[in-house]
């Protein structure tokens, strides 16, 4: 199961927003036809960049909507007992690799906390989101191959460590584990995404408390 | 005041190399993307390369690619161009410019420049 | 690569004058356009970023406007100082490129 059901759903961006707007667009004028996620995204990314602050302007709004309803839902909600902890991880396991925009944000965090000392650390992942947004195709380049090849370097690590792990792996049957496959790749990018948050709100509460020894 | 200040200039025969060197003051120098922009005698500008703030992302001209290598460090506020096998084509004004990422805007925009540094490659 | 071309390449104008310099993308870049001044013997200085956004510390007589492959640069009323080279750059993809330039003359 992926955590408590009756926890509040996050709160999305403006940017979000637009993203789902553009899907249910695009899902009314072609029902039937497939989405390539990179090229969609690419599109709405372009879109965005050109749009006037006024466009934006609604979409901000049910940014800011949705950040209160969760604040308010938040307020309520109490977390079961005994699933506070995350999930046990092997302190061996190879670590999952940064995303691209992870990449981007260790480069400019601290420019974004120098000039505005006072941002909660929402504001800070807030403005390096526009930042990223706004930032040329090209120049999102270097991060993007970076993320790729330190992706495909965990690929390697964790093929590597699970076969260790499951010496006997190799002598059960193919087809079995081709199926499953699919399924588990899916699971594993869902995963990902949630690990890549924590790694992220963990690294800027580090930062925290780093600033506050200064 | 914020201030660029290049040096490592001067005369050096095809084939030579030369090291130039950037003195950041009056900013946190480690905050932002520099870039290296050459002027030829009488002609335009020309882009040479860049490196992110923390100096693992670099990015070069086709021009110069394989001969230049930037670099930094932030300790010393101070950002480099390590130039080899120089050619007579390389002879320019060798400018250091700081690069202000937009954060709303988007695009990025040589904000700040040095006074320039003169690289001549002549036998 | 894309290619930033200028027009024109130099023109005479007298203070006072309106000033209007075209700078052309061989492809859409957006908004991602920056102006530049060069007096003789001096560094380039930012005068416009994200083809519209008049920098800290340049006066309000210069303006920019245009956006996908069409830019333009004005000084609303020339004055002595502003006789100089002016560069379009874009900062759309690498490697960033430049205009080839366009001299401010006095008539």
């Known amino acids: 199961g992926k955590g408590d059901p009756k926890k509040p759903r996050g709160k999305m961006s403006s940017y979000a927003f637009f993203v789902q707007t553009c899907r249910e667009e695009h899902k009314k004028k072609h029902p039937d036809a497939s989405v390539n996620f990179s090229e969609f995204s690419k599109k709405c990314s372009e879109r965005w960049k050109t749009m006037s602050a006024k466009e934006k302007g609604k979409f901000e709004d049910m940014a800011k909507a949705d950040k209160a309803r969760y604040e308010r839902e938040m307020k309520t909600y109490i977390p079961p007992k005994g699933e506070t902890k995350k999930k046990f991880k092997d302190p061996n396991a190879p670590k999952r690799p940064p995303s691209a925009f992870f990449l981007f944000c260790s480069e400019y965090r601290p420019k974004i906390k120098g000039e505005h000392p006072g941002l909660s650390i929402g504001d800070v992942a807030k403005k390096l989101g526009e930042m990223w947004n706004n930032t040329a195709a090209d120049d999102k380049q270097p991060y993007e191959k970076k993320a790729a090849k330190l992706k495909e370097k965990y690929e390697k690590d964790i093929a590597a460590y699970r076969a260790k792990g499951k010496p006997d792996a190799a002598k059960k049957g193919v087809v079995k584990a081709e199926k499953s496959k699919k399924k588990k790749e899916e699971e594993e990018d869902e995963e990902d995404e949630e690990d890549e948050e924590e790694e992220e709100d963990e690294e800027d509460e580090e930062e925290e408390e780093d600033d506050d020894d200064e | 005041e914020v201030q660029l200040l290049e040096s490592g200039g001067g005369l050096v025969q095809p084939g030579g190399s030369l090291r130039l060197s950037c003195a950041a003051s009056?900013?946190?120098?480690?905050?932002?993307?520099m870039s290296w922009v050459r002027q030829a005698p009488g002609k335009g500008l020309e882009w040479v390369s860049r490196?992110?703030?923390?100096?693992?992302?670099?990015m070069y001209a086709d021009s110069v690619k394989g001969r230049f290598t930037i670099s930094r460090d932030n300790s010393k506020n101070t950002l480099y161009l390590q130039m080899n096998s120089l050619r007579a084509e390389d002879t320019a004004v060798y400018y250091c410019?700081?690069?202000?990422?937009?954060?709303?805007?988007?695009?990025?925009?040589?904000?700040?420049w040095g006074q320039g540094t003169m690289v001549t490659v002549s036998s | 690569d894309i290619q930033m071309t200028q027009s024109p390449s130099s023109l005479s104008a007298s203070v006072g004058d309106r000033v209007t310099i075209t700078c052309r993308a061989s492809?859409?870049?957006?908004?991602?356009l920056n102006w530049y001044q060069q007096k003789p013997g001096k560094a380039p200085k930012l005068l416009i970023y994200?083809?519209?956004s008049l920098q800290s510390g340049v006066p309000s007589r210069f303006s920019g406007s245009g956006s996908g492959t069409d830019f333009t640069l004005t000084i609303s009323s020339l004055q002595p100082e502003d006789f100089a080279t002016y560069y379009c750059?874009?900062?759309?993809?690498?490697?960033?490129?430049f205009g080839q330039g366009t001299k401010v003359e006095i008539k």
């Open positions: 410019a700081r690069l202000e990422v937009g954060a709303t805007s988007g695009g990025t925009a040589f904000d700040i």
């Open positions: 009056g900013f946190t120098f480690s905050w932002y993307d």
């Open positions: 490196i992110s703030p923390s100096g693992g992302y670099t």
């Open positions: 492809q859409s870049i957006s908004s991602y």
């Open positions: 994200a083809a519209s």
């Open positions: 750059q874009q900062s759309y993809s690498t490697p960033r490129t």
